[in-house]
């Protein structure tokens, strides 16, 4: 028998520095977790102790903190090189700055193979990107060889900016011939490493003949066997065992997100490459693991540029940006409108001629807006200003919801109106009218939404049985502020870009902003 140790990360999202337990900015260092310096300590410890070790990343290193805003992926290549990753799969967020924003900082600089079997380049891009990413890579590990085959969510064109010259094929259809090829070349130990979410990971384990292990990402899935060491609630045991259609037991793993854990899986193979056993658990990278001094010193060196960036002007406002709780928790506020407009703008994707855009709606809990911005400071808006407005380090995500769920959400928005509670919704692409004289749960008297399948966008009444795409904070997608109906009833959830980054990009693009209160949210009394 031959034993392989797979160390894996996924959805790190720019968390190069250690973070608090909830993966936001580290405040009390003695209680902080993760970060590449701490990760390196643990990886090196395992590399020294065990003979056959692979360090893999399942995508979405890009996007999530000011590190990515400033360094645009150069930081990913630099620190992943320093940690000596063995391979990485492309995630959807690796395309956030377009194909050029992937090629130049990461694909050309990475000293490890970057993989995806289901992304095919066409047109002029085909020769430009040739060889910069691969469908698979065969790695020598100890006295054996291991094949690693990559995959990426086929929803990427709706979630990011890969452009028109990359085709995202069905994962299973694309993976099977690559695995078959490796088998014919006597590679009998094959890991599928990719970024399509836990449901697809399980399908790959079930359907792709010859895949021995699946290491996934995208859904931020936390798996654990035994008592979990922190706040994350396991979605299943680690590894999650799937019985394949040809009767094999295939371990599937994922390691939550944000570099908080290092996935640790030990696989035992027989001489024919069959998995005999698999066991392990994610390792919580808490403060009991010291940060590696040389990596930490490098982080501190790179950090200097970030501090300078946060005080630079992004753009100007010529109006007061009302982010006060007195406004945003009670009525339409122009800060809410600005943020929602930025959220929609960030998700402009012309992927179908029938649609002017794939999504037109935004909802945002008023309690998530934490500060106004005064225009009387020469109108200047900085990253620092935006960090005061959106201090929680969240993301603006894409969900699919039925109309009936949206109606419930808007009822929840005003179910205890008047108490300055955070659930009051700010909106974009939505016109809502409330009648507060009615009883809670029956206060939404009009709810019109902006069409997407139209050449001239207009507002139509919400249809209860129709499925709508909505951009919202991850806080709401996870049921925060009492929006349990969103969490329970959402049909799809894809994590998006860092909240501050979305707004800062929009302001930089617009240069001068003047958001108004324009009747998106109205109140009426009596008959309608």
């Amino acid at each position: 028998a031959w034993e392989l140790t797979i160390l894996h990360t996924n959805d790190v999202h720019s968390r190069l520095e250690q973070t608090s337990e909830d993966s936001s900015k580290c405040v009390n260092a003695s209680r902080c977790m993760g970060g590449v310096a701490r990760l390196f300590t643990k990886v090196q410890q395992i590399r020294r102790a065990e003979p056959n070790v692979l360090l893999l990343d399942a995508g979405d290193q890009y996007q999530g903190t000011i590190w990515f805003t400033v360094y645009k992926g150069a930081e990913v290549a630099h620190f992943m090189n320093a940690l000596r990753y063995d391979a990485m799969a492309l995630g959807n967020h690796e395309f956030d700055n377009g194909v050029e924003g992937l090629i130049e900082p990461l694909l050309k600089e990475a000293k490890f193979p970057i993989l995806s079997a289901n992304i095919k380049a066409k047109g002029p891009l085909a020769s430009q990107i040739s060889g910069l990413y691969l469908p698979y890579k065969v790695l020598p590990v100890g006295d054996e060889v291991v094949g690693i085959v990559g995959y990426t969510s086929k929803e990427t064109p709706f979630l990011s900016n890969p452009g028109t010259n990359l085709v995202f094929e069905d994962e299973i259809t694309a993976l099977q011939p690559e695995v078959d090829k490796l088998k014919t070349l006597n590679v009998n130990k094959i890991i599928a490493l990719g970024h399509s979410g836990f449901e697809m990971d399980k399908l790959i384990a079930q359907k792709v003949r010859g895949v021995d292990v699946v290491v996934g990402g995208h859904s931020n899935t936390f798996l654990y066997t035994g008592n979990p060491p922190s706040k994350e609630v396991p979605a299943g045991k680690y590894p999650f065992i799937v019985t394949s259609d040809d009767g094999r037991k295939v371990p599937v793993v994922q390691a939550y997100a944000f570099g908080k854990y290092l996935g640790y899986l030990k696989i035992e193979f027989d001489e024919r490459g069959n998995v005999i056993s698999s066991h392990g658990n994610p390792i919580l990278l808490n403060s009991s693991i010291p940060e590696d001094p040389s990596i930490k010193a490098d982080i501190n060196k790179w950090r200097i540029k970030l501090d300078n960036y946060s005080t630079q002007e992004l753009g100007k406002t010529i109006v007061y940006l009302d982010g006060s709780s007195q406004s945003c928790r009670f009525r339409e506020c122009n800060m809410g409108n600005l943020i929602c407009d930025a959220m929609i703008n960030n998700n402009l994707r012309h992927t179908d001629e029938m649609f002017w855009n794939h999504v037109s709606m935004c909802i945002l809990n008023g309690g998530g807006i934490r500060s106004p911005i005064d225009e009387r400071n020469n109108g200047t808006i900085t990253w620092e200003n935006l960090a005061a407005v959106l201090p929680f380090g969240g993301t603006f995500d894409l969900v699919q919801l039925k109309g009936s769920t949206l109606k419930k959400a808007f009822e929840h928005s005003v179910h205890r109106y008047g108490q300055s509670t955070g659930e009051f919704l700010q909106v974009g692409g939505i016109h809502v009218v409330y009648d507060l004289s009615r009883k809670p749960g029956d206060r939404v008297v009009k709810l019109d939404v902006l069409c997407t399948k139209c050449r001239v966008p207009s507002y139509d009444p919400l249809k209860m049985d129709e499925v709508y795409k909505v951009i919202l904070p991850n806080f709401l997608a996870n049921g925060g502020d009492g929006f349990q109906m969103i969490k329970d009833e959402l049909l799809r959830h894809d994590s998006g870009d860092q909240d501050i980054n979305v707004v800062s990009t929009y302001i930089s693009k617009m240069k001068v902003i003047y958001p108004a209160v324009e009747g998106r949210i109205k109140f009426s009394t009596g008959s309608h």
Partner: antibody
Framework: QVQLLQSAAEVRKPGASVKVSCKAS????????MDWVRQAPGQGLEWMGD????????IYNQKFKGRVTMTTDTSRRTAYMELRSLRSDDTAVYYC???????????WGQGTTVTVSS | DIQMTQSPSFLSASVGDRVTITCKAS??????LSWYQQKPGKAPKLLIY???RLIDGVPSRFSGSGSGTEFTLTISSLQPEDFATYYC?????????FGGGTKLEIK
């Protein structure tokens, strides 16, 4: 700068063994695999195998399996290739070559001539 | 094993010429191809890896292209120091295999 310094030329009789050494400098020895390649007189290049200095893991060309052993001594930053049961057609220049992150051979030793003759 | 077929085996050219050497793999090698230059009595020198990535310090007149099974090494304007033997090698799978070589001679 990266340098690979190989041992001097050797002459062996058929059936004997030879052990060629390759001393590395200018980089972290355990960060890269070492390959061995040979070239018979007037012929092309032939890959023999690969060793990971970190853990001693080896992958050999089946053609040489059972006759070749590759080892490393990390304290001496040296790789070794031993070939046993030598035949006259093993007469060749033997090269060690460091592999880069992509496993292409980016730095080569100067070569060690091994002559097998009765 | 994957067979690598290089052509031509011999090539006569003059200084300033543009020359192309081709390398065919018996099956798709996933862009895992390198090109080496070897001068008489010397060790091979890596010029290009991953089919088209030029090694630092190698003159830009050298370029690599191709994918799948067909690859080319192009020297845009031959210099006197370029007369040598060139080898392609696949490192997609084990065992690594080399092409038979192309000897580039002065016309």
């Amino acid at each position: 700068q990266v340098q690979l310094l190989q041992s001097a030329a050797e002459v062996r009789k058929p059936g004997a063994s030879v052990k060629v050494s390759c001393k590395a400098s200018g980089y972290t020895f355990t960060d890269s695999n070492m390959d061995w390649v040979r070239q018979a007189p007037g012929q092309g290049l032939e890959w023999m195998g690969d060793i990971n200095p970190n853990n001693g893991g080896t992958i050999y060309n089946q053609k040489f399996k059972g006759r070749v052993t590759m080892t490393t001594d990390t304290s001496r930053r040296t790789a070794y290739m031993e070939l046993r049961s030598l035949r006259s057609d093993d007469t060749a220049v033997y090269y060690c070559a460091r592999t880069n992150w992509d496993y292409a051979m980016d730095y080569w030793g100067q070569g060690t001539t091994v002559t097998v003759s009765s | 094993d994957i067979q690598m077929t290089q052509s031509p085996s011999f090539l006569s050219a003059s200084v300033g010429d543009r020359v192309t050497i081709t390398c065919k793999a018996s099956q798709d090698i996933n862009s895992q191809l390198s090109w080496y230059q070897q001068k008489p009595g010397k060790a091979p020198k890596l010029l290009i890896y991953r089919a088209n990535r030029l090694i630092d310090g190698v003159p830009s007149r050298f370029s690599g292209s191709g994918s799948g099974t067909e690859f080319t090494l192009t020297i845009s304007s031959l210099q006197p120091e370029d007369f040598a033997t060139y080898y392609c090698q696949q490192y997609d799978v084990f065992p690594r295999t080399f092409g038979g070589g192309t000897k580039l001679e002065i016309k």
